[in-house]
Interface confidence: medium
């Protein structure tokens, strides 16, 4: 699927408000950069079910961001 070879936001639209915790394999946070001027929270789902964007303003996203920042700093 040769699509989207360029630097830009990865999330199309605001994103889902929540993802079932049991379905989450991994959460990645993309901070604002030259490629994209907003924070993006990308959830990788278990069982090769792809990825979803989580709305960074949602309660779940804020908790994930907090958790990741605590871990990293």
């Amino acid at each position: 699927f040769p699509m989207f070879k360029r630097g830009r936001c990865l999330c199309i639209g605001p994103g889902v408000k929540a993802v079932k915790v049991a379905d989450i394999e991994k959460a990645s946070i993309m901070y604002p950069s030259n490629n994209c001027d907003k924070i993006e929270v990308i959830i990788t789902l278990k069982e090769n079910k792809g990825q979803r964007c989580l709305n960074p303003k949602s309660k779940q996203a804020r908790l994930i961001i907090k958790k990741v920042e605590r871990k990293n700093f």
């Epitope: 990865l10 199309i12 979803r52």
Partner: nanobody
Framework: EVQLVESGGGLVQAGGSLRLSCAAS????????MCWFRQAPGKEREGVSC????????YYADSVKGRFTISSDNAKNTVYLHMNSLKPEDTAVYYC??????????????????????WGQGTQVTVSS
């Protein structure tokens, strides 16, 4: 009731143009990525283009880049696909779909097709040589 209604398909000669429309109702347009897919006979459904209604960002498959343009009219809750320089290989049924949380990765199918929230019934586009 949620509805996505496509229109604008038809028969056109190679090199010609068409404009597809997708009228959405029954959900909050701005919360969704609005995408066009197509399915040719005997082939898998493939992503063509997406637009974020909230900020206007647009995304295209390599096969249509420079020829197709996606746009939306938020006041009318309608998404358009302007198709120029059409080729016989563009012949397919074109579907409009809406999903939340679409990631523009290697393809528009990062979100599995069955997880797209809403689908239209499709409109046939036939390009003759």
């Amino acid at each position: 009731e949620v509805q996505l209604v496509e229109s604008g398909g038809g028969l056109v000669q190679a090199g010609g143009s068409l404009r597809l429309s997708c009228a959405a109702s029954g959900f909050t347009f701005d919360d969704y990525a609005m995408c066009w897919f197509r399915q040719a006979p005997g082939k898998e459904r493939e992503g063509v283009s997406c637009i974020s209604s909230s900020d206007g960002s647009t995304y295209y498959a390599d096969s249509v880049k420079g020829r197709f343009t996606i746009s939306s009219d938020n006041a009318k809750n309608t998404v358009y696909l302007h198709m120029n320089s059409l080729k016989p290989e563009d012949t397919a049924v074109y579907y409009c779909a809406a999903a939340q949380g679409v990631v523009a990765g290697a393809s528009l199918v990062w979100v599995p097709l069955d997880e797209y929230d809403y689908w239209g019934q499709g409109t046939q586009v036939t390009v003759s040589s």
